[in-house]
C-alpha cells in the first residue's frame, strides 16, 4: 500500500515538473512573440513615416539641387562629427563646386553667422595632400587657404566664405550631406 502511494506521489511530481516546463516554454514563447511584435511595429512605423515623409530632405535639413545639408547645433571633434553624420545616413560635407560653396556660406550666414564648421576634408599625414572623405581630390579653387602648423592630423572647415584648416581634435560645429530623395510623382 505504501509503495502504491509512493508511486502515485512520484507520478504526480513528474506531472507537476512537466507542467512547470510547459508553462516556462509558454512564457518564453510569449516573450519571443512580444519581442517580434515590437520589431514588427518598429519596422511598420519606420516604413509608414518614410511613406508619409515624401519631402526630398528630412526635417531640419536644407535642400540645394540634389543635396540635403544638415548644420549641426553641437560642437564636436572632426572624427566624432563624421560618426554623427553616419548615424543620420550622411557624410561630412563634400564641396564639389564654387556654386555649392556659395550656397553653403550664404546659408550659414542666414542661420548662424560666422562660426567654424567641419567639412569632409582632411590632409594626408605622409603626402600632405588634401583629400575628401571618398578619396577624391578637391578642385584647385577649393583648397584650404592656410596650412595649419599642427603636428597632429589636420582637417578642413568652413568659416564665413573661406575654407580653412585646423587640428582635427579641436571642437567645431559640422555640416552633413546626403542625396535628396527624388520625387516619385
Amino acid at each position: 500500500k505504501l509503495l502504491q502511494v509512493s508511486t502515485i506521489a512520484m507520478q504526480q511530481q513528474e506531472k507537476l515538473i512537466q507542467q512547470e516546463r510547459a508553462l516556462l516554454n509558454f512564457t518564453e514563447w510569449k516573450r519571443s512573440c512580444a519581442l517580434q511584435m515590437k520589431y514588427c511595429q518598429a519596422f511598420m512605423q519606420n516604413s509608414l513615416s518614410s511613406a508619409h515623409n515624401s519631402s526630398p530632405c528630412p526635417n531640419n535639413w536644407i535642400q540645394n539641387r540634389e543635396s540635403c545639408y544638415y548644420v549641426s547645433e553641437i560642437w564636436s571633434i572632426w572624427h566624432t562629427s563624421q560618426e554623427n553624420c553616419l548615424k543620420e545616413g550622411s557624410t561630412l560635407l563634400q564641396i564639389e563646386s564654387k556654386e555649392e560653396m556659395d550656397f553653403i556660406t550664404g546659408s550659414l550666414r542666414k542661420i548662424k553667422g560666422s562660426y567654424d564648421y567641419w567639412v569632409g576634408l582632411s590632409q594626408d599625414g605622409h603626402s600632405g595632400r588634401w583629400l575628401w572623405q571618398d578619396g577624391s581630390s578637391p578642385s584647385p579653387g577649393l583648397l584650404p587657404a592656410e596650412r595649419s602648423q599642427s603636428a597632429n592630423q589636420v582637417c578642413g572647415y568652413v568659416k564665413s566664405n573661406s575654407l580653412l584648416s585646423s587640428n582635427c581634435s579641436t571642437w567645431k560645429y559640422f555640416i552633413c550631406e546626403k542625396y535628396a530623395l527624388r520625387s516619385s510623382v
Epitope: Y39, E83, K87, G135, K178
Partner: nanobody, 113 residues
C-alpha cells in the same frame, strides 16, 4: 547581430576581403562601417558607407581599401589591397543607427612576412 568573416594572415602587398552580414534584428541602419583596433591602440574608423552608397575612408587607407555593399544593404564588404604590416589589427563591423550602435565580434587581420 553582425557577423564578420574574411580575416586571416597575409603577406605585405597582399589582399583580403572582409564581409559583414547584418541579421534582420537590426532596424533603421543608416550606414555600415569597419573599425580596427591594433594592440595598445584606440579603435579607429577605417571606412564606412551610407545607405545611399556614399563612402568615407580614413586617410591611411585611401586608394588601397574599398568599401561596398550588396543591393539589399544587409552585407558590407571591405576590399583591402596593398596591405602593410601597420594594417595588422582586429577589424570590427559597425551598424550606425540613430539610436544604438551595433558591433560585430571582430576578425583578426595579420600582415606579416
Amino acid at each position: 547581430q553582425l557577423q564578420e568573416s574574411g580575416g586571416g594572415l597575409v603577406q605585405p602587398g597582399g589582399s583580403l576581403r572582409l564581409s559583414c552580414a547584418a541579421s534582420g534584428r537590426i532596424f533603421s541602419v543608416n550606414a555600415m562601417g569597419w573599425y580596427r583596433q591594433a594592440p595598445g591602440k584606440q579603435r579607429e574608423l577605417v571606412a564606412a558607407i551610407t545607405n545611399q552608397g556614399a563612402p568615407t575612408y580614413a586617410d591611411s587607407v585611401k586608394g588601397r581599401f574599398t568599401i561596398s555593399r550588396d543591393n539589399a544593404g544587409n552585407t558590407v564588404y571591405l576590399q583591402m589591397n596593398s596591405l602593410r604590416p601597420e594594417d595588422t589589427a582586429v577589424y570590427y563591423c559597425k551598424a550606425f543607427t540613430r539610436g544604438d550602435d551595433y558591433w560585430g565580434q571582430g576578425t583578426q587581420v595579420t600582415v606579416s612576412s
